[in-house]
């Protein structure tokens, strides 16, 4: 095993930074391992509804906090109406999926497209029809849907009426929405994600103000939002586990995102401690209650005593173990801009392999789905995205090394993203798609980039052949 726990750090992620060369079975400078992934490895690709659907007020869809935020906070962006128009060009998305040959497609449901004001009453028929058609088409193609219930597009009405995720009333409302989705789509969906990267929802939505709803500076609100997101996830997991799993036989998790960090001085225990704090304050914040002991990490409880809410003993018991696998996001959103508080004066790193090893050590070697991975290119780059290929090759090599050399139980990989689209605070200034879309065109053709061809080959060969 590459990264072995050393004395004093047993079962603790700090061991990652205390490398003993005697325990390293592979030269760290060896960038690529020419080998295949396990048989039946789950290859997929993903999108977020707000990023690609467009049609932000078409066919009865209600506004989301991001639609509002775009109009009030983001300069030079009229709306997501341009985008890739997946709502209109569903068939083109399906063709793109066919081209790559993925085993699964991860997409999110736009809550306000189903329920314009967020409250579960009669669903918006056109919205229901869109997702139902998409699911039927995926099943027909033997492409497994992985469905995210919340990828940041909260119905604006819930923000205005309740204050959004700051108000614990939203927990039950989210559970009602999830129940509806399980009822309507659960026969065709075996993998559910409750919330995509709650860290960014809380930190950038309520701390830096860089994400919707754009509130900033209130640390108590940041941690209250995080608390409510965790409780909402847990409630939905228990709901699914009790009422839907017995007959739908699916799995449910939450996608947690993180950066990776390296100590300034690898032999310095204080720098190592700071790296541990850094990971704990971002990934551990959500992973510890869900994948760990049901509570916030002890360091966070000490350091943030005045702003971090508490879980009662009953709640700790309720939070613990509310994920059927570890869904992990590792991409630019957790790196740029990185919370300087989380950086702790250390050096950020794109070492996905080590991040996976940290998860293994901290959370008892869970089954892991890479639920989002990839990088970005400048918006001027069209189909020749060589940087994206380099990054993909690097990341995939790290995942393969983690599986083959470190015995980490990664069972699937989600390339991000299927299409160029709206990239949150970066709007349309960067591109993350494996398919190029000219946002100014009428037909929004999906043109495969070099990275799409490359990923197609990786999937076909199930890894790297010599």
């Amino acid at each position: 095993i590459l990264l072995r726990a050393v004395t004093g750090f047993s079962g603790d992620g700090r061991a990652i930074w205390s490398k003993n060369p005697n325990f390293t079975p592979v030269n760290e400078s060896q960038l690529f391992l020419y080998d295949t992934f396990p048989k039946n490895f789950f290859w997929g690709i993903g999108t977020g509804a707000l990023q690609v659907e467009g049609s932000w007020k078409k066919d009865g869809k209600g506004p989301s906090i991001w639609d509002h935020f775009i109009h009030t906070h983001l300069k030079n962006v009229s709306s997501t109406n341009g985008s890739s128009d997946s709502y209109i060009f569903l068939e083109k998305d399906l063709s793109a999926l066919d081209f790559i040959g993925v085993s699964f497609y991860q997409f999110s449901i736009s809550w306000p497209r189903l329920f314009p004001d967020g409250i579960v009453t009669v669903a918006n028929a056109k919205g229901l029809q869109y997702y139902s058609t998409l699911l039927d088409a995926l099943v027909l193609r033997n492409i497994e849907p992985i469905v995210t219930l919340y990828h940041w597009d909260l119905p604006l009405a819930l923000q205005e009426k309740y204050g959004g995720w700051k108000n614990d009333t939203i927990i039950d409302i989210f559970n009602d929405y999830a129940t509806y989705c399980f009822q309507m789509f659960g026969d065709r969906v075996k993998y559910w994600i409750t919330i995509h990267n709650p860290y960014l929802v809380a930190w950038h939505g309520y701390g830096t103000g860089m994400h919707a709803p754009g509130e900033k500076g209130n640390l108590a609100a940041v941690y209250t939002v995080g608390h409510n997101l965790i409780k909402a996830h847990s409630k939905v997991w228990h709901n699914y586990n009790t009422h839907f799993r017995p007959h739908q036989k699916g799995w449910l998790s939450i996608t947690l995102g993180s950066h990776w960090i390296e100590p300034n001085r690898s032999e310095n225990t204080m720098d190592i401690f700071k790296c541990q704090q850094s990971m704990v304050s971002v990934l551990g914040w959500f992973a510890n209650p869900i994948h760990g002991d049901g509570d916030y990490p002890e360091g966070m409880r000490k350091k943030l005593f005045s702003v971090l809410p508490i879980f009662s003993e009953a709640e700790k018991h309720e939070m613990r173990g509310t994920a059927d696998f570890f869904a992990f996001s590792f991409g630019p959103n957790n790196f740029k801009p990185l919370n300087t508080m989380a950086k702790m004066g250390q050096n950020v790193s794109l070492n996905l392999r080590e991040a996976l090893n940290w998860i293994k050590l901290e959370y008892n070697n869970p089954r892991i789905l890479i639920a989002e991975n990839g990088w970005f290119t400048d918006s001027r780059v069209k189909t020749e995205d060589t940087t994206a290929i380099y990054m993909m090759k690097n990341f995939l090599s790290q995942v393969l090394q983690a599986i083959r050399l470190d015995e980490i139980r990664v069972f699937g990989y989600t390339a991000w993203s299927l299409l160029d689209g709206f990239e949150w605070q970066d709007a349309y200034t960067i591109r993350r798609g494996l398919f190029y879309v000219d946002f100014n065109s009428k037909q929004k053709e999906r043109k495969p980039k070099s990275s799409a061809h490359y990923y197609k080959q990786i999937i076909r060969e199930n890894g790297f052949s010599l």
């Epitope: 360091g299 000490k302 809410p309 508490i310």
Partner: antibody
Framework: QIQLLESGPGLVKPSETLSLTCTVS??????????WSWIRQPPGKGLEWIGF???????NYNPSLKSRVTISIDTSKNQFSLKLNSVTAADTAVYYC???????????????WGQGTTVTVSS | QSVLTQPPSVSAAPGQKVTISCSGS????????VAWYQQLPGTAPKLLIY???KRPSGIPDRFSGSKSGTSATLGITGLQTGDEADYYC???????????FGGGTKLTVL
């Protein structure tokens, strides 16, 4: 060695505003591990927390005093201050400024105290 | 009325052992960390125990702290006359969003 020193009038008239300043020496009020606090002790009674302020300006106050209290910080002077409005005889006490500490590895509580200053509310 | 409950007084002879209890609830002691303070007559309080059971440098190991559930205990062994003081427990209360103290316990060394 960090030291805290309270300063301000020892006598305040009822209904007026009590104002105290704490000067920090041997350390900085800009550290992220500390909450700069005010605590008081009425004659013959126990300790009562008034509130604290973080270097960024964030504050927490005792709910029973919240409507009358303002704590501010001046990082350039390495000082923090207390204002308590509409005082009555019940506000007569020894007022301590203090450093409340909590880090990633340890919860310290109030680890450094000033010597205290007696404030009497009387006409 | 203090949020944390301490006995008003305890006493013991020199050389003996004494314990002072501090009782709270899940919103304070139960889910947070406890500190203990010693206030000698006419002086400012001094930190005696932090993080439930740790001693700052300079505090003799005759002083110890522990926590169980929603209660904390300060122990003093080998009592000395110089230990005569008021002792306070303190912690954060998550429901009140406030620092809370016990009412104080007067230790008399007989």
């Amino acid at each position: 060695q960090i030291q805290l020193l309270e300063s301000g009038p020892g006598l305040v008239k009822p209904s007026e505003t009590l104002s105290l300043t704490c000067t920090v020496s041997g350390g900085s009020v800009s550290s992220g591990d500390y909450y700069w606090s005010w605590i008081r002790q009425p004659p013959g009674k126990g300790l009562e927390w008034i509130g604290f302020i973080y270097y960024s300006g964030g504050t927490n106050y005792n709910p029973s005093l919240k409507s009358r209290v303002t704590i501010s910080i001046d990082t350039s002077k390495n000082q923090f201050s207390l204002k308590l409005n509409s005082v009555t005889a019940a506000d007569t006490a020894v007022y301590y400024c203090a450093r409340y500490s909590s880090t990633w590895d340890y919860y310290y509580g109030v680890d450094v105290w000033g010597q205290g200053t007696t404030v009497t509310v009387s006409s | 009325q203090s949020v944390l409950t301490q006995p008003p007084s305890v006493s013991a002879a020199p050389g003996q052992k004494v314990t002072i209890s501090c009782s709270g609830s899940s919103s304070n002691i139960g889910n947070n960390y406890v500190a203990w303070y010693q206030q000698l007559p006419g002086t400012a309080p001094k930190l005696l125990i932090y993080d439930n059971d740790k001693r700052p440098s300079g505090i003799p190991d005759r002083f110890s702290g522990s926590k169980s559930g929603t209660s904390a205990t300060l122990g003093i062994t080998g009592l000395q006359t110089g230990d005569e003081a008021d002792y306070y427990c303190g912690t954060w209360d998550s429901s009140l969003s406030a620092v809370v103290f016990g009412g104080g316990t007067k230790l008399t060394v007989l």
